[in-house]
Amino acid sequence: MRRGPRSLRGRDAPAPTPCVPAECFDLLVRHCVACGLLRTPRPKPAGASSPAPRTALQPQESVGAGAGEAALPLPGLL
């Protein structure tokens, strides 16, 4: 089982985002989008093998409108 992906790479902007609190910065298209109902993954156990990039979350976890704070320790953040 792998650790969830490690984080911040080249294209990422430094926190905080330029977005208003109810929005998130979508790195795929590089702009702010509404994220109040967005579902994202929950972290896998910080398991064995080599660390993978970015801390992942598991499908089906709901992230509310105040999703500005990371709910987990996120190793590798710049």
Epitope: R2, P5, R9, C35
Partner: antibody, heavy 126, light 107 residues
């Protein structure tokens, strides 16, 4: 069970229109972005379009821009692809797929497509 | 548009073999690289996301590595059900793009 069931494929003449549907079940459809991807016979996979969970943003591949429209009805748990001005080169198996993302702080990171429909064949031929 | 080049385009291997497939991006995509398996007449299945994270339910014999422009999918011990076509896909920017696949055949 999480699944996407597709319908609407068929044989159509060049220049005509067709609408594909993708019915979602087993997950909260209205909380996920969705994609369409296609695969022409013996060819590579080609991304067609993506729509945000709430329909607020849509992006298209260059080959379909201005001809295809992605949409969704969250009350019906259904994704659509309206295909107009069809060309021979649009002949392919079309797949709907769920966008796999991670929210890190206020950043959305994209992890590809984690749930796929079974595919539906579109044949454009005169 | 980011072009993904997979190699080899096909390979023959035996059950138990270690198989390595590579994917090269035309520009740096960090770790935004995903791997899929597709069997004839079926939809693709996500195996690896973010270059090296194993998708839930995927056997641990599959692993991914790399960042920047060069990525690798490894099957540590090929099983009969692993004979399929494997695709890489970048999720760094739109348009999303796929490699053209590596077909793993029985030797």
């Amino acid at each position: 069970e999480v699944q996407l069931v597709q319908s609407g494929g068929g044989v159509v003449q060049p220049g005509r229109s067709l609408r594909l549907s993708c019915a979602a079940s087993g997950f909260t459809f209205g909380s996920y972005g969705m994609h369409w991807v296609r695969q022409a016979p013996g060819k590579c996979l080609e991304w067609v379009a993506v729509i945000w969970y709430d329909g607020s943003n849509k992006y298209y591949g260059d080959s379909v821009k201005g001809r295809f429209t992605i949409s969704r009805d969250n009350s019906k748990n259904t994704l659509y692809l309206q295909m107009n001005s069809l060309r021979d080169e649009d002949t392919a198996v079309y797949y709907c797929a769920r966008r796999f993302t991670h929210l890190r702080g206020q950043y959305i990171e994209d992890y590809g497509m984690d749930v796929w429909g079974q595919g539906t064949t579109v044949t454009v031929s005169s | 548009e980011i072009v993904l080049t997979q190699s080899p385009s096909s390979l023959s291997a035996s059950v138990g073999d270690r198989v390595t497939i590579t994917c090269r991006a035309s520009q740096s995509i960090s770790s935004y690289l995903n791997w899929y398996q597709q069997k004839p007449g079926k939809a693709p299945k996500l195996l690896i996301y973010a270059a090296s994270s194993l998708q839930s339910g995927v056997p641990s014999r599959f692993s991914g590595s790399g960042s920047g422009t060069d990525f690798t999918l490894t099957i540590s011990s090929l099983q009969p059900e692993d004979f399929a076509t494997y695709y890489c896909q970048q999720s760094y920017s739109t348009p999303l793009t796929f490699g053209c696949g590596t077909k793993v055949e029985i030797k």
